[in-house]
C-alpha cells in the first residue's frame, strides 16, 4: 500500500535569465528510494539513481545542475521554460510517486523597464 | 546490439535448486537495473526480481520471496537467479529483461530460458 | 495487487485493418503502463511506456493513450509482422503485474 506523499514547491516564478531551485520531498513512508526522475513535459531532464548518481540529460547539460539534495537547479532561465515539471519518486516496495510543479518564467524587471521607458 | 543471453535452465524435482545466468552484451550493463520475468505454460507474464545497477537493493514478488535471490556480477556482465525449494507452480520460461534509464519499462528481453520442475 | 484485464483475448484481423486493444486496472496507476509484442521464438519487444511514448524503433502506426485505469494500445493500419500477442504492464505499485494478453490473428 502506498503510503507516501510528494510535497513540492507548487507553482513558482523566476526572471529571465535567472535560476530556480526545483524541490520534491517524499515523506510518509518507509520505502526504499531507487531513483528519481526529473522531467519536463515528456522529456527526462535528469536522474538521480540510488547506486550511481545523478544522470543528466545530454541536451540539457549546459543549462541543469544536480542538487541540492534530489532537487534540480535550472539555470539561464529562458520563457520557454515556463511549464509543468514532474518529479518521479521510483520507490520499493511503494512503486512509483509522481510530484507537479509549475514554472512561470517572467521577462525580467530590467527588461520590462527598457521597454518602458525610453532614455530621450 | 543489446543482447541477453539466459541460460541454466532445465528439468528439477520439487524442493530442488537452479541457478539461472543471463550473460548481456552491447551495452554498458553496470549502467542498468535488471530483472527477471517469467512466463508459465500457456499463461501471461510474471515479474520475478529486480536488482538495481550496483547491486545495492533486490525486490520480489511474494509469490518468491525468501526461495529466489537475484544478483549481479559486474564485471562480467552477468545477472543470476538463484531459486530454492522450487514448486511445480515455478515451472516456466524466464525472461531476462534490462530497464529503461528512467525506469519506466523494461526495454530490452532476452529469448528465456525454460525451467520445469517436476517429479 | 493490482489487477490487469486486457480485452479482447483475442481478435482476427486483416492487413491494413485499424486494431484497439485496452487495459483496465484494478485502481489508477497514473499513466505508468507499458506495452509489449511478444511473437513466438522471439524476444519480447517494448512497444510504448508511461502510457504514449513509442520506444525508439518502434513504428508510428502504434500509439497508446489513456489514464486512471483506463488504457489503449491502437495500431492504426495493421501490417504482417504485426501479428503477435500484446501485453499491457503496470508499474506504478509493486508487484508489477501484467495483462492476460492479446492474440492478434490474421482473419
Known amino acids: 500500500m502506498m503510503t507516501g506523499t510528494i510535497e513540492t514547491t507548487g507553482n513558482i516564478s523566476a526572471e529571465k535569465g535567472g535560476s530556480i531551485i526545483l524541490q520534491c520531498h517524499l515523506s510518509s513512508t518507509t520505502a526504499q528510494v531507487t531513483q528519481v526522475n526529473w522531467e519536463q513535459q515528456d522529456q527526462l531532464l535528469a536522474i538521480c539513481n540510488a547506486d550511481l548518481g545523478w544522470h543528466i540529460s545530454p541536451s540539457f547539460k549546459d543549462r541543469v545542475a544536480p542538487g541540492p539534495g534530489l532537487g534540480l537547479t535550472l539555470q539561464s532561465l529562458t520563457v520557454n521554460d515556463t511549464g509543468e515539471y514532474f518529479c518521479i519518486y521510483h520507490t520499493y516496495p511503494d512503486g512509483t510517486y509522481t510530484g507537479r510543479i509549475f514554472l512561470e518564467v517572467l521577462e525580467s524587471s530590467v527588461a520590462e523597464h527598457g521597454a518602458r521607458f525610453q532614455i530621450p | 546490439e543489446v543482447q541477453l543471453l539466459e541460460s541454466g535452465g532445465g528439468l528439477v524435482q520439487p524442493g530442488g535448486s537452479l541457478r539461472l545466468s543471463c550473460a548481456a552484451s552491447?551495452?554498458?550493463?553496470?549502467?542498468?537495473?535488471m530483472s527477471w520475468v517469467r512466463q508459465a505454460p500457456g499463461k501471461g507474464l510474471e515479474w520475478v526480481s529486480t536488482?538495481?545497477?550496483?547491486?545495492?537493493?533486490?525486490y520480489y514478488p511474494d509469490s518468491v520471496k525468501g526461495r529466489f535471490t537475484i544478483s549481479r556480477d559486474n564485471s562480467k556482465n552477468t545477472l543470476y537467479l538463484q531459486m530454492n525449494s522450487l514448486r511445480a507452480e515455478d515451472t516456466a520460461v524466464y525472461y531476462c529483461?534490462?530497464?529503461?534509464?528512467?525506469?519506466?519499462?523494461?526495454?530490452?528481453w532476452g529469448q528465456g530460458t525454460t525451467v520445469t520442475v517436476s517429479s | 495487487d493490482i489487477q490487469m484485464t486486457q480485452s479482447p483475448s483475442s481478435l482476427s484481423a486483416s492487413v491494413g485493418d485499424r486494431v484497439t486493444i485496452t487495459c483496465r486496472a484494478s485502481?489508477?496507476?497514473?499513466?505508468?503502463l507499458n506495452w509489449y509484442q511478444q511473437k513466438p521464438g522471439k524476444a519480447v519487444k517494448l512497444l510504448l511506456y508511461?502510457?504514449?511514448r513509442l520506444h525508439s524503433g518502434v513504428p508510428s502506426r502504434f500509439s497508446g493513450s489513456g489514464s486512471g485505469t483506463d488504457y489503449t494500445l491502437t495500431i492504426s493500419s495493421l501490417q504482417p509482422e504485426d501479428f503477435a500477442t500484446y501485453f499491457c504492464?503496470?508499474?506504478?505499485?509493486?508487484?508489477?503485474?501484467f495483462g492476460g494478453g492479446t492474440k492478434v490473428e490474421i482473419k
Open positions: 529483461t534490462r530497464w529503461l534509464l528512467s525506469l519506466y519499462a523494461m526495454d530490452y
Open positions: 552491447g551495452f554498458t550493463f553496470s549502467n542498468y537495473v
Open positions: 536488482i538495481t545497477s550496483g547491486g545495492t537493493y533486490t
Open positions: 485502481q489508477d496507476i497514473s499513466n505508468f
Open positions: 508511461y502510457t504514449s
Open positions: 504492464q503496470q508499474g506504478k505499485t509493486y508487484p508489477y503485474t
